[in-house]
């Protein structure tokens, strides 16, 4: 029987969500509990690491949100952003695979604000690089498993 | 081994951005530099050409923006859109396969503005049929590889 | 020849959305015309039930749109929701994947609306559970094919 | 094919009137509403207006809500922007456009469009 492909889905860590509205690398994120789950990929210090050279399908879903009881939002106009973001130890270096968002305007006077974010794409990946999601605005992440978390699964071999 | 499944994974030629604002077919992908990258599949005239019949998923994440040291932007009131495109060469047809986007208004007086849009899904192609990509206001996009893009790999078999 | 991988595409039944602004499930899919298709899964009231224990990638697309010659919007903020529910039938019980969306002003007087929704992800399934979509605002839906779907297809075996 | 020709934009006044006109040709019946937009100096386009075929109901942009008035002439096929108590920022060149579905993003026919200047 065939090796089993590495993939993973994690879930963001609502217990460890950065203040403040500048970009972050989000760096605590459940990987084994709820639908978060991992096999033949490593977590380490939240980044996801490749252990098996491979083409993988790459995704991530940010949802941000705030509601008028929380005071106002940091600034008038937002940038609410996410970055997929490859770093190779051997050469250390850090590249955006994907990025996406939406700039917003929030000092309006409704009870509830909501945005999400969804990106995805394919990628050559080789054992020891590492996967980490950056945001802008991180105290307005929501923090359900279902809305805020990143994955990846290996769809084929390199050669 | 098994031969290797189709794959594509194309990013915006930034030199070749259409201006204006009506819907274009955005015709100059990269497949060979940076994250780009093509395998059992082909690229001609800005189509990516099925080789080989199969289930694809195909996707696609478009990236608009602007700068208040650009100008006003086109109208009052954008509608900000990506439409994934199959066309068969056969019984020569075109079909849209996704959709995706938002209307904005980018009248007010913010410095920057952004907007993305990802649709994804998974689709019958066979040999021969083409897949492009429309936007509305091409003037806008950005033309960085991590912000619009699309791709396909394929995923199995027809029978 | 390995047994074929499940997949479902389904599309939006135009003729069957509910109207309303509250949360609904959306009960009624194609799946069998123009890009909708199953294999070894099964629509079921609505439903997409497993068949086949698996990973499976999921995904929805899912469109919002209002015109003026229709009225008014149902409220000044919307929320433009959707949720990727998973419903297991052998121990009674509803719990989302994915959720995704906006808050929205419509009440501008642009002559078109439209916003769109795009969420994906990698899950565990088990023989007899179900996926299914609930949306706000259905009265707003987009009923076109390319506009309004889900899908799911099995990337690999459990063990 | 439908074919749209603007006219009537000239020089004219603060607090002044101007009506333009949009002449309609070809396939009148596969038109779904007509608009007027403008494009001021240094600006993007605007909506200004629409008119339904079904119906003539009208909808107008806030900035125009009050002065300027759309209607249409069936017998001769013309739409009309009646613009009343005009202001300098109502310069601009006005362009006349046709869509033929409801759910379509885009305009499918414009003019060549009528210049207006308002001076003070």
């Known amino acids: 029987k065939p090796e089993a492909q590495p993939f993973a889905h994690l879930t963001i860590n609502a217990a460890s969500i950065p203040s403040g509205s500048h970009k972050v690398t989000l760096s605590s994120w459940y990987h084994d509990r709820g639908w978060a789950k991992i096999s033949n990929m490593t977590l380490s210090n939240g980044k996801l690491r490749v252990n098996q050279d491979g083409f993988y399908y790459l995704y991530a879903n940010i949802c941000f949100r705030h509601h008028e009881t929380s005071g106002s939002v940091p600034t008038d106009y937002l940038q609410l952003m996410v970055y997929v973001v490859k770093t190779s130890i051997k050469i250390p270096s850090s590249h955006n695979l994907m990025k996406g968002g939406s700039t917003k305007n929030w000092s309006g006077n409704s009870e509830f604000h909501f945005y999400s974010i969804n990106v995805g794409g394919f990628f050559k990946l080789r054992a020891g690089e590492e996967i980490s999601i950056q945001v802008s605005n991180p105290s307005l992440l929501d923090p359900d498993q279902d809305a805020t978390y990143f994955g990846a699964f290996k769809v084929q071999d390199i050669d | 081994k098994p031969e290797a499944q189709p794959f594509a994974h194309l990013t915006i030629n930034a030199a070749s951005i259409p201006s204006g604002s009506h819907k274009v077919t955005l015709s100059s992908w990269y497949h060979d530099r940076g994250w780009a990258k093509i395998s059992n599949m082909t690229l001609s005239n800005g189509k990516l050409r099925v080789n080989q019949d199969g289930f694809y998923y195909l996707y696609a994440n478009i990236c608009f923006r602007h700068h208040e040291t650009s100008g006003s932007v086109p109208t009052d009131y954008l509608q900000l859109m990506v439409y994934v495109v199959k066309t068969s060469i056969k019984i020569p047809s075109s079909h849209n396969l996704m959709k995706g986007g938002s209307t904005k208004n980018w009248s007010g007086n913010s410095e920057f503005h952004f907007y993305s849009i990802n649709v994804g899904g998974f689709f019958k192609l066979r040999a021969g049929e083409e897949i492009s990509i429309q936007v509305s206001n091409p003037s806008l996009l950005d033309p960085d590889q991590d912000a619009t893009y699309f791709g396909a790999f394929k995923v199995q078999d027809i029978d | 020849k390995p047994e074929a991988q499940p997949f479902a595409h389904l599309t939006i039944n135009a003729a069957s959305i509910p109207s309303g602004s509250h949360k609904v499930t959306l009960s009624s899919w194609y799946h069998d015309r123009g890009w909708a298709k199953i294999s070894n899964m099964t629509l079921s009231n609505g439903k997409l039930r497993v068949n086949q224990d698996g990973f499976y990638y999921l995904y929805a697309n899912i469109c919002f749109r209002h015109h003026e010659t229709s009225g008014s919007v149902p409220t000044d903020y919307l929320q433009l929701m959707v949720y990727v529910v998973k419903t297991s039938i052998k121990i009674p019980s509803s719990h989302n994947l994915m959720k995704g969306g906006s808050t929205k002003n419509w009440s501008g007087n642009s002559e078109f609306h439209f916003y769109s929704i795009n969420v994906g992800g990698f899950f565990k399934l088990r023989a007899g559970e179900e996926i299914s979509i609930q949306v706000s605002n259905p009265s707003l839906l987009d009923p076109d094919q390319d506009a309004t779907y889900f899908g799911a297809f099995k990337v690999q075996d459990i063990d | 094919e439908v074919q749209l020709v603007e006219s009537g934009g000239k020089l004219v006044q603060a607090g002044g009137s101007l009506r333009l006109s949009c002449a309609v040709s070809g396939r009148t019946s596969s038109i779904y509403n007509m608009a007027w937009f403008r494009q001021g100096p240094g600006k993007g386009r605007e909506s200004v207006g629409r008119?339904?075929?079904?119906?003539?109901?009208?909808y107008y942009a806030d900035s125009v809500k009050g002065r300027f008035t759309i209607s249409r002439d069936n017998a001769t096929n013309t739409v009309y922007l009646q613009m009343n108590s005009l202001k300098p920022e109502d310069t601009a060149v006005y362009y006349c456009?046709?869509?033929?579905?409801?759910?379509?993003?885009?305009?499918?026919?414009w003019g060549q469009g009528t210049q207006v200047t308002v001076s003070s």
């Open positions: 008119i339904y075929w079904s119906d003539d109901n009208t």
């Open positions: 456009a046709g869509k033929t579905t409801k759910w379509s993003l885009e305009y499918d026919y």
